[in-house]
């Protein structure tokens, strides 16, 4: 008789995770006779997948009927693939005995498990940053095999260049994770804008997964102060506004002083949104001119997101004669804007001052 | 190791049935065929039946095919072998045996059921 | 059906000798490149033991002074130099077909 042989057909065999797997091995004689195993790897260390005549394996059926007469195919299905179960898998003969004896094996099939990569997930600073910071995002997806992947970042739909990523691990794995870190300049207008992680990967059949971060979350966009003033009333009192202009988030809380003196102070809430996502407040004083001798100093205070507050300042003249009908009661604005330590560029603050 | 343990021996009147079974331990019985074989006093071999306990597939033999029949209780890896309209010359010893090749052989024996019919 | 016819029904060999038993088939047991016979040994009291299978193959744990040979009709058991514990009934078995056996060769020690 002929020198038995064990065949097994494929080298190798890429499964989809989630789906079976089958792999195929017959034997070229019934001679010996003996069982026909299943390792997943060689040596001592090799893990038994299935044998044909003991133990119990769920997961594993073989292809043909093991009473069938003259069966000589020893295939096996593998069902529910995980990347776990990548490797490869060795069909062995052994010759029937008290143990049975090792005989011939196959020369191996890798089993490689296309798995598919987790949805994105992306996720921004821990703190808001001004315009012209820099801020990372970073996006991680796991879970999937074989290892290349392409990873893309966008911010409005425009493809971004400043971006770093890692696959791991290095070497061979049953499956692999990427990370990427993408740096992205803020502006004024970013308010409403998006990054966007898209991965792409043999598994997805060409629709890339996308995970997104809304910018609202990682910026900060600084108030523009303003002061206005309307004529002297019938009643000696003067009504002055502090206009807090295109700031976000809407987290600000406003206070006026008088010389110094506390006065008043308000905390913004249920604002209306502007179109680029800011918001506007506007806050009124009315001063009492005749309850002054002296010119009054005001100042607007806004602690906005809880950054060191802004102050704008504001002088109120009182005339000399303040009891005399049809009298002037001057009012000049004395410019000063003190910021804290705050160091706020105001690049388009010209484009709004009439903005009320 | 591969064990077949058959039930104890049975007297019986001429015209009654019997019913023999096999324990198998030590390998997969759904993977295995069992037969059933049986021996007079002082004769030879005679080969009665087999089953596939995977999907119990029976092969008689022609003498047996309308007073004997097989099957299997998967649950508890025990083949039956049941004999109608008992004999005088039914007395026999009756074996179970595993086929382990699936070549129609007999590579495992059970030690045997003395069925005694008498009146 | 089948039928196998061993001889000789009964055998005498001195210890050490070679014995030898032989089936003839009524027809071809060959099939698929293999000669469907086996080769049994029951000893009193005992149930058989499969010795040889496809006609030349021992079968696990079998000393090699049990062969078996032949194809087509005709096969033969040759046991090359008898010992005491062969004293034994030997019998041959067909499955090209449903399984048959032959009447036995009781085999004892001149």
């Known amino acids: 008789e002929e020198e038995l042989q064990v065949i097994q057909p494929e080298k190798s065999v890429s499964v989809a995770a989630g789906e079976s797997a089958t792999l195929n091995c017959t034997a070229t004689s019934l001679i010996p006779v003996g069982p026909i195993q299943w390792f997943r790897g060689v040596g001592p260390g090799r893990e038994l997948i299935y044998h044909q005549k003991e133990g119990h394996f769920p997961r594993v059926t073989p292809v043909s009927d093991p009473t069938k007469r003259n069966n000589m195919d020893f295939s096996i299905r593998i069902s529910n693939i995980t990347p776990a179960d990548a490797g490869t898998y060795y069909c062995v003969k052994f010759r029937k005995g008290s143990p049975d004896v090792e005989l011939k094996s196959g020369a191996g099939t890798e089993l490689s498990v296309r798995a598919k990569p987790s949805a994105p997930v992306v996720s921004g600073p821990a703190v808001r940053a001004t315009a012209e910071h820099t801020v990372s995002f970073t996006c991680e997806s796991h879970g999937f095999s074989p290892r290349d992947i392409t990873l893309k970042w966008f911010k409005n739909g425009n493809e971004l260049s400043d971006f770093q990523t890692n696959v791991d691990p290095a070497g061979k794995s049953v499956s692999y994770s990427i990370r990427s870190t993408a740096r992205v300049v803020l502006t004024r207008r970013d308010v409403h804008s998006q990054v966007i992680c898209e991965v792409a990967h043999v598994t997805l059949q060409g629709d890339p997964l996308r995970g997104t971060a809304n910018l609202s979350e990682a910026i900060r966009v600084p108030p523009f102060l303003e002061f206005t003033q309307q004529s002297m009333r019938a009643d000696n009192q003067v009504n002055v506004t502090c206009q807090v202009m295109k700031f976000y988030p809407q987290r600000l809380q406003l206070t006026w002083l008088e010389n110094g003196n506390v006065s008043r102070t308000e905390m913004a809430s249920a604002l209306p949104e502007n179109k680029d996502g800011t918001y506007n407040w506007t806050s009124w004083l009315l001063v009492n001119v005749s309850a002054h001798r002296d010119d009054v100093k005001l100042t607007c205070q806004v602690e906005h997101d809880g950054q060191p507050a802004v102050n704008k300042s504001f002088s109120v003249k009182v005339s000399a004669h303040p009891k005399e009908q049809g009298s002037n009661t001057a009012a000049e604005n004395t410019g000063t804007n003190e910021r804290g330590s705050s160091d706020y560029k105001d690049d388009d603050d010209k484009h709004h001052h009439h903005h009320h | 190791q591969v064990q077949l343990v058959q039930s104890g021996a049975e007297v019986k009147k001429p015209g009654a049935s019997v019913k023999v079974s096999c324990k198998a331990s030590?390998?997969?019985?759904?993977?295995?065929?069992i037969n059933w074989v049986r021996q007079a006093p002082g004769q030879g071999l005679e080969w009665i039946a087999m089953i596939d306990p995977s999907d119990s597939e029976t092969h008689y033999n022609q003498i047996f095919k309308d007073r004997a029949t097989l099957t299997t209780d998967t649950s508890t890896s025990t083949a039956y072998m049941e004999l109608r309209s008992l004999r005088s010359d039914d007395t026999a010893v009756y074996y179970c045996a595993m086929d382990y090749g699936s070549l129609y052989a007999m590579d495992y024996w059970g030690r045997g059921t003395l069925v005694t019919v008498s009146s | 059906d089948i039928v196998l016819t061993q001889s000789p029904d009964s055998l005498a060999v001195s210890l050490g000798e070679r014995a030898t038993i032989n089936c003839r088939a009524s027809k071809s047991v060959s099939s698929s490149g293999y000669n469907w016979i086996f080769w049994y040994q029951q000893k009193p009291g005992q149930p058989p033991k499969l010795l040889i299978y496809?006609?030349?193959n021992r079968d696990s744990g079998v000393p090699d002074r049990f062969s078996g040979s032949g194809s087509g009709t005709d096969f033969t058991l040759t046991i090359s130099s008898l010992q005491a514990e062969d004293v034994a009934v030997y019998y041959c078995?067909?499955?090209?077909?449903?399984?048959?056996f032959g009447q036995g060769t009781k085999l004892e020690i001149k």
């Open positions: 030590g390998y997969t019985f759904t993977n295995y065929w």
């Open positions: 078995q067909e499955s090209r077909e449903l399984p048959t």
């Open positions: 496809l006609a030349s």
